[in-house]
Amino acid sequence: WELTILHTNDVHSRLEQTSEDSSKCVNASRCMGGVARLFTKVQQIRRAEPNVLLLDAGDQYQGTIWFTVYKGAEVAHFMNALRYDAMALGNHEFDNGVEGLIEPLLKEAKFPILSANIKAKGPLASQISGLYLPYKVLPVGDEVVGIVGYTSKETPFLSNPGTNLVFEDEITALQPEVDKLKTLNVNKIIALGHSGFETDKLIAQKVRGVDVVVGGHSNTFLYTGNPPSKEVPAGKYPFIVTSDDGRKVPVVQAYAFGKYLGYLKIEFDERGNVISSHGNPILLNSSIPEDPSIKADINKWRIKLDNYSTQELGKTIVYLDGSSQSCRFRECNMGNLICDAMINNNLRHADEMFWNHVSMCILNGGGIRSPIDERNNGTITWENLAAVLPFGGTFDLVQLKGSTLKKAFEHSVHRYGQSTGEFLQVGGIHVVYDLSRKPGDRVVKLDVLCTKCRVPSYDPLKMDEIYKVILPNFLANGGDGFQMIKDELLRHDSGDQDINVVSTYISKMKVIYPAVEGRIKFS
């Protein structure tokens, strides 16, 4: 018996087609992805093959103005239109709190939404009961397939799930659910979830009875043969893991942003054992036409977005200096504003020992593309912010050793004075440079804001300590020459859309007046 698994993950609000780098589509003839194009390909496969499942491994939420405006209603609407068979909850599904998941998505989805390792407690338990499930048994042709879901146990540090959801260890939580499926005579089981490729592989190895793992969170691109676009494969598709009980378990993921549709063909024997697996992600490029009815629906929903982008988010009573003459040479108040917003967006009261789990932000000055003039009645709109942050990136959470941070700050000024983009703006950091010294040895003071303290204060950077830092995904990926970050990061979790982070902060503060306050000094 043969099963075709079509899968997406980490779509992050890319409902419309995008450029090759998943930013806003500029030249339509070279654009990719989007739900209208995805629908065309899915329907084509459904017509051609008998046993097809369309699965999503989480993080549909967060990433473009679509999510900012529609807050998840767009996800439910278009996933329903594409007739997804199941979805696993990702960490970003909790970005607007549990209510922001329940109302727009859980109550509106016509497909099961899954996670076995999220347990509700207190008053939420009855409210959310039945709206998401640990597993679902789906009829596919003459057979049944069990889908069991999982979500990153780090979600409380990455999003806003509140205090009434407990995120258990994935493997510990999955095993009893898989065992339950076995007792129900379900012998073909897919683990669908959002914890990252390393955890996906562990699930394949450790959870007895899981036949296939369909994952997300780490934006992992797997491919067999010559890849069709710019993404470099992390391994073959599918990635085969030998389980502790000796089975060959295929593990797949389909990069991110709806650029690819994962396509995996599995052959099972009559006892539900995987005999063979093969496939590849399908690049959703312009050779695949956008479905006209879905496209028309997208255009209808788009109207509200255009209106939103000119509405006032808040006011500034000071000039927001985002000029390259400032932000690439010295501390600039636009950099301070953005970093403050980045930290504010990551406030998660950890416990009595920590006022927050993260206190530091770094931001390449070259990523700040425009100032905002306060003389336009102080009005700040989404459109203004899109000029400041035009690249459609995310602000991510990483863990770095102090020694890596030191290298990053040396890199920040290694060729100072040439208006290059690597000059770092900061939050929760006080740095002093001495430009009379040789490159690589210009950082003379580097103090960082404590997290394990009731009254935050600045302490010298410790080289061997591990620090959490919020930074643009561009830097996490080694952009602007920050190769040391990419090479030495100990953990990387994708965050929220950059403009959304700043717009939310401005809306919350109502009136802003960021200053230049001595975060960056020269001796």
Partner: antibody, heavy 120, light 107 residues
Amino acid sequence: EVQLVESGGGLVQPGRSLRLSCVASGFTFDDYAMHWVRQAPGKGLEWVSGISWNSGSIGYADSVKGRFTISRDNAKNSLYLQMNSLRAEDTAFYYCAQGGYAILTALEYWGQGTLVTVSS
Amino acid sequence: DIQMTQSPSSLSASVGDRVTITCRASQGISNYLAWFQQKPGKAPKSLIYAASSLQSGVPSKFSGSGSGTDFTLTISSLQPEDFATYYCQQYNSYPLTFGGGTKVEIK
């Protein structure tokens, strides 16, 4: 576990030279600034010299400037102090100490010291 | 050069006493001050950095405070193993300089 082991001390006549070595283990040597600090018998501590991770920044106490040279070999996890034109007042225990990310950071770990005696 | 003046130069105290040592810099050094403990025949041991931050592994009976020019090291309840000489040191600017030391003896 961080370990710093000094060697090269001994009895030397005034005007002569001596080279002290310090071998480090238990940490990534080329991430850290390193220092020499000395202590004359029964006296207090005196900073002698410091060197940044890549030898880009070097500092000396006025009392040794022009006579002592600090250096490091990151490949060998070693710190050195070349002491020329030694004087009786250079007699002291010489300690190697680990700094932080730059020279102007706190000293954290210290070696057990090596005794230099300058006497005729 | 920045002069570091420690006081007292010596003190006698009993087990269980609260002991305070002060250190004054000849000019402002922000919080770039460290405290060390040294026992006879041993290398100095780092206790406090950045004026008030405890080095890992150092018991919480030791605390530091101050900023600018005036700093204190406090031992909340003196124990037999705390009888030693204590030094302050500034690392705000070259040359790094130490205080003259405070010898804590048994009364």
